[in-house]
């Protein structure tokens, strides 16, 4: 079995986690993809997922999580905005491929969110130009409930901060001021 590894990434409250999960284009371009959190002794919990089939470059927002799947690049971009200390925990991207088990995209991210936002006076995490405008009807995709029980045995030690994850939609103000697609060449 492939050894599961993780990388620690530390941010402050109010900042944005912005990661890119690679996948094999030929196999998984239109597959449904998800962002999960792994709690101690529990199955990975899906926080957000793309549509099924996954739409190219179509932002999906679930609360403070935004997913964008770039089929041409084999890349799922995940953003968690306005981070809170309670968001600390172990995260992973997976690809749903029923009836088979979800395929995990390496590596897992050990997110550590600390108190105290480091912005300069007058700066705004949400201020940007030439943003990608998310339509008012941004999709909230339905995510499959199943998760591989096999991954439970591989759950890592509990992180220092307990993780609370919203099951319901969280209102995110000015989301159109946060998201901008990469300028792919």
């Amino acid at each position: 079995a492939t050894k599961l590894t993780e990388e620690k990434y530390e941010l402050k409250e109010g900042q944005t986690l912005d990661v890119k999960c690679d996948y094999t284009l030929e196999k998984f371009a239109s597959s449904q993809k998800a962002w999960q959190i792994i709690r101690d002794g529990e199955m990975p919990k899906t926080l957000a997922c793309t549509e099924r089939p996954s739409k190219n470059s179509h932002p999906v927002q679930v609360g403070r999580i935004i997913l964008e799947d770039y089929h041409d690049h084999g890349l799922l971009r995940v953003r968690m905005v306005n981070l809170q200390v309670e968001d600390s925990g172990l995260y992973q991207c997976v690809i749903y491929q029923p009836p088979k088990e979800p395929h995990m995209l390496f590596d897992r991210i050990r997110l550590v969110v600390t108190k105290g936002f480091s912005g300069t006076p007058g700066s705004n995490e949400n201020s940007t130009q030439n943003v990608y405008k998310i339509p008012p009807t941004t999709t909230k995709a339905l995510c499959p409930l199943y998760t591989s029980p096999r991954t439970v045995t591989q759950a890592p030690p509990k992180s220092t901060a307990d993780v609370s994850t919203p099951d319901s939609e969280i209102n995110l103000t000015n989301v159109t001021d946060i998201i901008r697609v990469p300028v792919f060449n």
Partner: antibody, heavy 119, light 108 residues
């Protein structure tokens, strides 16, 4: 211990070609995006190219697009940069760098290899 | 492409003094900013990522702050080994990753 070791640099005439290699160890090479970053003598850092891990997608700076090709051999834990139609302005130290935490920033760098393009 | 501008180009500081380096982005990069240190004849070394998080093994005298378009790297008390060139890099709007032109911190 993570190590990146570049090779293949040297002197070449304008219009010529070179192939740089970067042998890596200490991490699971196939999982990580890798980049080439260059530095002209006495100048700053310039990102040149990136190749993603699982997808194999490639990206290039406008200054090298169509002339340089990035590739990797996961079985050999090696990253490559094929440089064709070299110009005087391509003269630089070329570093290979490992991506950190699924983001396009770099936590490990090689020592660099010097490419000199001169007639 | 996002343009990163660093100032000053050269900073002359005495050992033990505080050094403040600035980096400005042409448009918002949120907190997706890193700082690197490069000494003569060496490869760059990651100091700060996420605008304010010290990379593994980086001393506490290095601190980063800012978000959006304005960022600062502060070295609280310069040691002899800190005299080097410092680069900021944005990794928000990718590709390309863009670096600032660098700030050289020299002994006064």
């Amino acid at each position: 211990e993570v190590q990146l070791l570049e090779s293949g640099g040297g002197m070449v005439q304008p219009g010529g070609s070179l192939r740089l290699s970067c042998a890596v160890s200490g991490f699971t090479f196939s999982r990580y995006a890798m980049s080439w970053v260059r530095q002209a003598p006495g100048k700053g850092l310039e990102w040149v190219s990136e190749m993603r891990g699982s997808s194999g997608s490639t990206y290039y700076a406008d200054s090298v697009k169509g002339r340089f090709t990035i590739s990797r051999d996961n079985s050999k834990n090696t990253l490559y940069l094929q440089m064709n139609s070299l110009r005087v302005e391509d003269t630089a130290i070329y570093y290979c760098a490992k991506e950190f935490s699924s983001n396009s920033l770099f936590d490990y760098w090689g020592q660099g290899t010097l490419v000199t393009v001169s007639s | 492409e996002i343009v990163m501008t660093q100032s000053p180009a050269t900073l002359s500081v005495s050992p033990g003094e505080r050094a403040t380096l600035s980096c400005r982005a042409s448009q918002s990069v949120n907190s997706n900013l890193a700082w690197y240190q490069q000494k003569p004849g060496q490869a760059p070394r990651l100091l700060i990522y996420g605008a304010s998080t010290r990379a593994t093994g980086i001393p506490a005298r290095f601190s980063g702050s800012g978000s959006g378009t304005e960022f600062t790297l502060t070295i609280s008390s310069l040691q002899s080994e800190d005299f080097a060139v410092y680069y900021c890099q944005q990794f928000y709007n990718w590709p390309p990753n863009t670096f600032g032109q660098g700030t050289k911190v020299e002994i006064k």
